[in-house]
Structure formats: structure tokens, C-alpha cells
């Protein structure tokens, strides 16, 4: 009888053998920044090292009574979830604990920063194998906390944090809002987002994925073999830290970007009931529940991509929003989305030597989002080819003309306030896969990339009658790199990728008074790397 | 995830007073910023993380901290350097009166200052 949470994250092929996936994270050290812990608990005894680090504020209240089992409860439970002998995810992982939370579970940004510096210093003094840092805590948005996390991540450390238990946008909290940190929300046995009293799990674009976080069995500090059930995004983050330890043990050379992409890739997709989230957050919140890879097979052959949403631009006329990929990722396409439909498109720009996706708000618009498609592709070299507005009835076109470059994404940007008043172009003629087509009043941007063995194809799905949503998905073995709408008329709210599916959203045409002639098509660009497939076949 | 110009309270103090002489003034036109937690009950005034510019030499952290202490003392304020950061960010943690923020923001090499705040087990 394995706890529900371990069953949930375990692929079917392991279940017959109860829960004993291979290796168990033995090559990885997990740092836990939390309360003190009961290191002689049978679940974690011998696999946890209590460092001498302690930086905690005084407990509140004059009559506060320090009871060891209470002081240790949060940290002990999480240590058990990460690597407990019986109820742990990565049973082989070693743990090091740093005390940054007091007996009431409260700490400070400064104390946690000093803890992160302690880890970095330890790493410099004695470099070991892969490191995972678990931060099962949250405070208000902090520039310095996020900056410190960024530095540590860039030093090769994997940071995993709780999204927060405030039933709020995770972007308002730190370290949850740090882009380099893997931020984890909580779901329950029914794959519902976790409710905690009147609050619950945080959500939004700063969450990377969800994991089990309700009624999680783990070590209790009440006795050395006791267990207790606890709930929260800390428990969810502990699952992901354990999964990360397992993955890094199987492939110690994985970078943070590769690990994050794998976590997303192996997650259960579209199982969370999104109705729990506020309506405006549903599209931004990833519908992903973490799981272990189905085996220790090296997944390096796949072309991994993920979708990154920008912050909201705000409503001012010239407002823009920027979506960025992580350090080792390549931006393969850029799209935009506006709930009001008033936007002026998007384009890929260079910023500090890196490509970013910028979306433009329109006059009277409530604001836009930029949506970047961020991929892992070795030896990739990309450029953007732009065609200015054609003004001709056929619309604007641009293609990838460099030898060996393939089309990975199409973007369009326009200066006119309302494309809807202009006649839309016809759909792209078939048989021209390396070409982007857009509205004659828009400039069109083709993302053209070269990488060994990279091949891409354009897949279109058009619906003659107006629809609020048109989708097109890439087949197995192909990865969605680009997602854009055709045509670029005013009732299109925008386009974005959800896993391997391109979604084009339109305004409810019945309320806009538009004619049913305004058809919408979703254009997906699906790619794969023959080079990576061959490399994986050679490995096997 | 969150951009650095994100949803938190930022107080930009563009201070170019010269009461401490040119040596203490930032480069022309540069402004250090002050940040604090947008959630008021979680604020911890009186403790501040002073973050120096990225390219600052590690010895500069101690030097800037000492300079702040000296200038604060001249004004009759006690300060306590609680920690000097070297390995992640250049900077230091200081316990001081909020009255000294203007002064601290004018110190050379200072990128921004953040008031300490609480974090909680989740």
C-alpha cells in the first residue's frame, strides 16, 4: 500500500514492483532550507547531514515555548518526502539541512540569502556532484532574493521552491517569481488544485508545474518512526526536488534548462481542473502534474520545448510585454495574446545578445502578453527574416532563404490600430513550408533556424465558421515550435502553445457582430531533429 | 516568471545631493533604488540588504560597508554590519535606522537597497 502521492508520480512500469525506481538519486545532494529537523528519524537517519548553518529570527510572543518536536516538524516531514526510506521520492538521495526558519516556521529574506551563500561557498570549497536546493518557503516579491537565486542557478545549482499557499498569483512572491527557480504548485489525489483553509495553492505563469501536495504522508517529528499527513506547496516542491534528484542521478550532466524541460515533458498533461483558478489565470497556469520519467532511458534525442508567458503589459497604448527564455534555451517562435483582442502583434528582438519575444498593446486595449516558445536544440543558430507590410491583396510573405535554415515560427506586427477594418489575406498556398504569410498591413517575421538534422513542417487547421478556439497539434515524434493565427483580423485574441498543441483564440463572434465569413486558422510548425534521433539510437 | 521591473513596491530615490562631497556621489546620472516588501505586515524595517553593482570587486563590499558606518557615525547614528556577501551577490546586510537610506543610496557602487522581510514555511 504505497501512499497515493508516490503512486501518482510513478510511471506504470514501476508500479508492479511497488515503488522502487532505479538509483534513487544517490549521486545527488539535496540542500533543504527550512526548520530544524529530527535527523535520527528512521526515515532519514544516515542520509541527512545537519549542517551547522542557522540564521533564524526570534520566535514571536513572550510566552513561546520551544518544543523540539514542533520546531522540527516542517523540515522533518519535507526531508522524509524528498528521501525517506519508506515514504520518500528519491530514497537514495543525500540531504543537507540548513535552518532558516524558526520554530514557528518563520524566517527572513536576509537569513535565507546567507543560507544560499553558505551553499555556494560549500560548492566552491568542495565541488561535488549535482546539487538540488529545496526552498519550501515564500515571502513577498523580493528583487534581491530572486537575484541570489539567479546567481546560484547560473552556478549550476537546481533550485526548487514552493509556489506559495496564498491562492494568489505566484509572481507576487519570492522565490516563486524567480525565473531560474523551478516553482511548484500543489494538487490533490483528485488532481484538483489544493485548497488550504480559505486559501490554497498559488497559480499563474510563475508556476512551472504542479505536484502532489495534499495529505502527503511523511516523517513526523513526534517519534523516530512516526508518520504524519501534511499539505502545502512545500510538500509539492519536495516531490519535484526528489524527482529532480532521480533524473540528475540518471543523467548527472543535465543542465537546469534540460532538467526543467524534462520535468515538463514527463508531467501528466491536462489533468488539473482549471475551473478552480481565477478565469484570467487559467491560460497562464500550466496544466502539468510532475511525474518520474518512465525509465532511466536518456531522453536526449527529443526536441524539448516549453511555453513561457510574459508579465501583462498593462493597458497604456504603447505598452509592451517581453517573454524571455532561460539561459541555455533558444527562442524558436513568438506569439501574443490579448483578452480584449486589441493588440498590435509581436516580434522577436535581440536584447543583450539574446532573442526575446515582445508583444505590443493597441489603443483601447487592456494589455497584452508575449508568449515565447523556448526550446533545447544543440548547435542551433537562428535569425529573423522580416517583410514589411505588403499593402497588396495577397498579404505579406516572408520565407527562410538561407541554405539549411528551416522555419520554426511566424510572428506579425502592425502599426495600424485595427486590422479588422482591412481586408484579410487568403490563407497561405500549400506546398510552401518555409514561408510565413500575414495581413497586408502587417510586417511579418520568420524565425529561421539551422541545427544539425533539424526538419520542420507546417500544419494548418482552418474552420470556415467562426469559432472561439481553433487547435492544431503536432504528431508523436514531432515537437511544436511555432503557433500563429491566420488571418490576423481583429477578432483573433492571439495564439499560444499548450504542450504540443497550437491554440488560436478568437473573440465570441456573436457578441462582436462580426460576420461568419471571418474564418480562423491555426498554424502549427512542428519540428524534430534527425541528428538527435540518430544520437539516441547510437546510445541504445 | 517575474521580470525585475515586476509587481512589487519600488521607491526610486534619485539622490544627487553633494553634502558628502563628490567622493560619495554616484556616477553622473546613476540612481540607486530602494525596494521593500509590498505586503506591509511582512516588512522588517531596520535591516537592509545593500546590493552593489554586479562588476564590483569583492573588496569593495567591506569598503562600502565601512564607509556607510563612518558616514552614519558622523551623523550620530549607530549601524551594525551583520553580514558581508561575496559568493552570490556583492553587498552586505546592515542594521540601521531608515533615516540613513538616503545616505546609503548615494554611496558609490550601490545598485539597490532592499529592506529585509519575512518568509514563511509553506
Amino acid at each position: 500500500s504505497i501512499p497515493w502521492n508516490l503512486e501518482r508520480i510513478t510511471p506504470a512500469r514501476y508500479r508492479a514492483d511497488e515503488y522502487q525506481p532505479p538509483k534513487g538519486g544517490s549521486l545527488v545532494e539535496v540542500y533543504l532550507l527550512d526548520t530544524s529537523i529530527q535527523s535520527d528519524h528512521r526515515e532519514i537517519e544516515g542520509r541527512v547531514m545537519v549542517t551547522d548553518f542557522e540564521s533564524v529570527p526570534e520566535e514571536d510572543g513572550t510566552r513561546f515555548h520551544r518544543q523540539a518536536s514542533k520546531c522540527d516538524s516542517h523540515g522533518t516531514h519535507l526531508a522524509g518526502v524528498v528521501s525517506g526510506r519508506d515514504a520518500g521520492v528519491a530514497k537514495g538521495a543525500g540531504l543537507r539541512s540548513l535552518r532558516v526558519l524558526n520554530c514557528q516556521g518563520k524566517g527572513t529574506v536576509s537569513g535565507t540569502l546567507i543560507g544560499l551563500e553558505f551553499i555556494r561557498k560549500s560548492q566552491l570549497v568542495q565541488p561535488v556532484g549535482p546539487l538540488v536546493v529545496l526552498l519550501p518557503l515564500a515571502g513577498g516579491y523580493s528583487r534581491v532574493f530572486n537575484a541570489a537565486c539567479q546567481r546560484l542557478a547560473r552556478a549550476g545549482v537546481v533550485l526548487v521552491t514552493a509556489a506559495g499557499n496564498f491562492r494568489d498569483d505566484a509572481c507576487l512572491y519570492s522565490p516563486a517569481s524567480a525565473p531560474e527557480v523551478i516553482t511548484v504548485g500543489a494538487t490533490n489525489a483528485q488532481d484538483q488544485p489544493v485548497t488550504l483553509g480559505t486559501l490554497g495553492t498559488n497559480f499563474g505563469r510563475c508556476v512551472d508545474l504542479f505536484a502532489p501536495g495534499e495529505d502527503i504522508i511523511g516523517a513526523s517529528s513526534d517519534c523516530s518512526t512516526c508518520f504524519v499527513s501534511r499539505s502545502g506547496t512545500s510538500q509539492a516542491a519536495a516531490h519535484v526536488a526528489g524527482i529532480a534528484a532521480m533524473m540528475l542521478s540518471a543523467e548527472p550532466e543535465l543542465t537546469l534548462a534540460e532538467l526543467r524541460q524534462r520535468l515538463i515533458h514527463f508531467s501528466a498533461k491536462d489533468v488539473i481542473n482549471e475551473a478552480w483558478f481565477p478565469e484570467d489565470q487559467r491560460v497562464l497556469t500550466p496544466n502539468l502534474v510532475a511525474a518520474l520519467p518512465p525509465s532511466t532511458h536518456r531522453a536526449g534525442w527529443q526536441l524539448f520545448c516549453r511555453t513561457v508567458w510574459s508579465a501583462h503589459s498593462g493597458p497604456t497604448r504603447m505598452a509592451t510585454a517581453v517573454a524571455r527564455c532561460a539561459q541555455d534555451e533558444e527562442l524558436l517562435s513568438c506569439s501574443s495574446f490579448s483578452r480584449s483582442g486589441k493588440r498590435r502583434g509581436e516580434r522577436i528582438e535581440a536584447q543583450g545578445g539574446k532573442r526575446v519575444c515582445r508583444a505590443h498593446n493597441a489603443f483601447g486595449g487592456e494589455g497584452v502578453y508575449a508568449i515565447a516558445r523556448c526550446c533545447l536544440l544543440p548547435q542551433v543558430n537562428c535569425s529573423v527574416h522580416t517583410a514589411p507590410p505588403a499593402g497588396a491583396s495577397m498579404g505579406t510573405r516572408v520565407h527562410c532563404h538561407q541554405q539549411g535554415h528551416v522555419l520554426t515560427g511566424c510572428s506579425s506586427h502592425w502599426e495600424v490600430e485595427d486590422l479588422g477594418t482591412h481586408k484579410p489575406p487568403v490563407l497561405r498556398p500549400r506546398g510552401q513550408p518555409n514561408q510565413c504569410v500575414g495581413h497586408r498591413e502587417a510586417s511579418i517575421h520568420a524565425s529561421c533556424c539551422h541545427a544539425p538534422g533539424l526538419e520542420c513542417k507546417v500544419k494548418e487547421h482552418g474552420i470556415p465558421a467562426p469559432q472561439e478556439q481553433v487547435i492544431v497539434a503536432c504528431e508523436d515524434g514531432w515537437t511544436l515550435t511555432g503557433c500563429s493565427p491566420l488571418p490576423g483580423t481583429s477578432h483573433v485574441l492571439g495564439a499560444y502553445a499548450v504542450d504540443n498543441t497550437c491554440v488560436v483564440r478568437s473573440r465570441d463572434v456573436s457578441t462582436t457582430g462580426s460576420t461568419s465569413k471571418e474564418a480562423v486558422a491555426a498554424v502549427a510548425i512542428c519540428c524534430r531533429s534527425r541528428h538527435l534521433v540518430q544520437a539516441s539510437q547510437e546510445l541504445q | 516568471q517575474e521580470d525585475e521591473d515586476g509587481d512589487y513596491e519600488e521607491l526610486v530615490l534619485a539622490l544627487r545631493s553633494e553634502e558628502d562631497g563628490l567622493a560619495d556621489a554616484p556616477e553622473h546620472g546613476a540612481t540607486a533604488t530602494f525596494h521593500r516588501c509590498a505586503k506591509d505586515p511582512w516588512r522588517l524595517p531596520g535591516t537592509y540588504v545593500v546590493v552593489l553593482k554586479e562588476e564590483t570587486h569583492r573588496s569593495q563590499s567591506e569598503r562600502t560597508a565601512r564607509r556607510l558606518q563612518a558616514q552614519a557615525a558622523r551623523r550620530g547614528y549607530l549601524t551594525k554590519i551583520l553580514h558581508v556577501f561575496h559568493h552570490l551577490l556583492p553587498g552586505f546586510l546592515v542594521k540601521m535606522s531608515g533615516d540613513l537610506l538616503e545616505l546609503a543610496l548615494k554611496l558609490p557602487h550601490v545598485d539597490y537597497i532592499e529592506e529585509d522581510s519575512s518568509v514563511f514555511a509553506q
Epitope: 501512499p3 519508506d86 515514504a87 513526523s220 517519534c223 523516530s224 518512526t225 512516526c226 | -
Partner: antibody, heavy 118, light 108 residues
């Protein structure tokens, strides 16, 4: 080899008291806690309390909190169970057993019978 | 408080037969469950620790399995000296030591 030897049992009047001894040998005395367990005739096992000889710390089953006192004499490698206000239902075989907290009770004494009767 | 429920209360079998005793915990206890054997007039003796590990000197016919809440003690082929009472035991916070009610294995 590890040995635990109980003594001090016998017939006691209701309301009376007695002190049982458990002499330990064959291992490092301070490394293991000692547990006192009793078994009424024809019944199951019931935990009374334990002592950590290393620091003298004790813990009791709430049922025995006011009736039992556990102590130790490290110089003699001996543990004691003092039982007060005895009643007929305290008639049982009393065992001492050793364990590290959270581990199994790996060695047991032979037991000593306490009969409470007038 | 954890409650350990042993079943059956009595098991009547002949030598050479297989004996299966179950112990169910009222809440999750991982694999931290121990089994003891007690013969009439003797102290209990440790058989199995941590659900499945045989204690020193215990014959291979005794085996333990299970984890979480459901545990089993199996005697593959009963010897005459195996007829006794068997107890399961776990740790808890209060009281810290909890025993099952016992299962008597008697000769049929």
C-alpha cells in the same frame, strides 16, 4: 552475550508497592533504552515506560504515569521499576527489554511475576 | 494513537502447514513494524524487524512482508516448536510502543 535479568517480583498486598530490578550485561549500557512491559495472565503485552540510561530521561504510558517510576544506577548497570498503590489488576509478569528508540525490542529479560492479592 | 489489529485471533493448523498472520495498522507506519513470538512461560522473542528482516538466529521459514498499513507474517511450514502466540508491534508518539492483540497458533 546480551543478557537482561529481572528480579524483585513476588506477592504484594493491595495498596502496597515494590521495586523490580533489571540487571543488564553484554553490551554498552548507555547505548540502549530499556523498556518495561507487562503481561497480565492470558492477556497481551502492555508497555509501561522506558528510560534512556545515557541521560536518565524517562517516558511513561499515561496509564502508569502516577503508579510507576523508572530509574537507573549506571555503576551497577541496573534499571529499576518502582510500582506504587498496587491493585489486583496489576498482577502480571513484568519484563524489561532493550531497544534503540524506533527499533525492535531485540532482547528481553525472562520476566518476573508480581501477584497482588490479600 | 495507532491501533494494531491482528487476524485471526486463533489459527488452528497442523505441522507442515503454512501459517499466515496479518496485522493491520490504523494509519501509515511505513515498514517500521516488528513481529515477536511468545511461547507459554517464556518472554517474547524478536522474529522479524522492519517488516521483512529476520532477526539473528531466526529460521528461514519465517518471513515478513508488507508496508504502509498492511503486514503479513508467514511461516512456510509449521514445526512443532512454532505453536505459540505472535505479536506485531509499532512505534507511535503516545503511547510510543504499541502491540497488536496477538494471534495464537495452535495445533489442530
Amino acid at each position: 552475550q546480551v543478557q537482561l535479568l529481572e528480579s524483585g517480583g513476588g506477592l504484594v498486598q493491595p495498596g502496597g508497592s515494590l521495586r523490580l530490578s533489571c540487571k543488564a550485561s553484554g553490551y554498552t549500557f548507555s547505548s540502549y533504552s530499556i523498556y518495561w512491559v507487562r503481561q497480565a495472565p492470558g492477556k497481551g503485552l502492555e508497555w509501561i515506560g522506558w528510560i534512556d540510561p545515557g541521560n536518565g530521561g524517562t517516558r511513561y504510558n499515561q496509564k502508569f504515569q502516577s503508579k510507576a517510576t523508572i530509574s537507573r544506577d549506571n555503576s551497577k548497570n541496573t534499571l529499576y521499576l518502582q510500582m506504587n498503590s498496587l491493585r489486583a489488576e496489576d498482577t502480571a509478569v513484568y519484563y524489561c527489554a532493550r531497544a534503540r528508540v524506533g527499533y525492535s525490542l531485540d532482547y528481553w529479560g525472562q520476566g518476573t511475576l508480581v501477584t497482588v492479592s490479600s | 494513537e495507532i491501533v494494531l489489529t491482528q487476524s485471526p485471533a486463533t489459527l488452528s493448523l497442523s505441522p507442515g502447514e503454512r501459517a499466515t498472520i496479518t496485522c493491520r495498522a490504523s494509519q501509515y507506519v511505513g515498514s517500521y513494524l516488528n513481529w515477536y513470538q511468545q511461547k507459554p512461560g517464556q518472554a517474547p522473542r524478536l522474529l522479524i524487524y522492519d517488516a521483512s528482516n529476520r532477526a539473528t538466529g531466526i529460521p528461514a521459514r519465517f518471513s515478513g512482508s508488507g508496508s504502509g498499513t498492511d503486514f503479513t507474517l508467514t511461516i512456510s511450514s509449521l514445526e512443532p516448536e512454532d505453536f505459540a502466540v505472535y505479536y506485531c508491534q509499532v512505534w507511535d508518539s503516545s503511547p510510543p510502543v504499541v502491540f497488536g492483540g496477538g494471534t495464537k497458533v495452535e495445533i489442530k
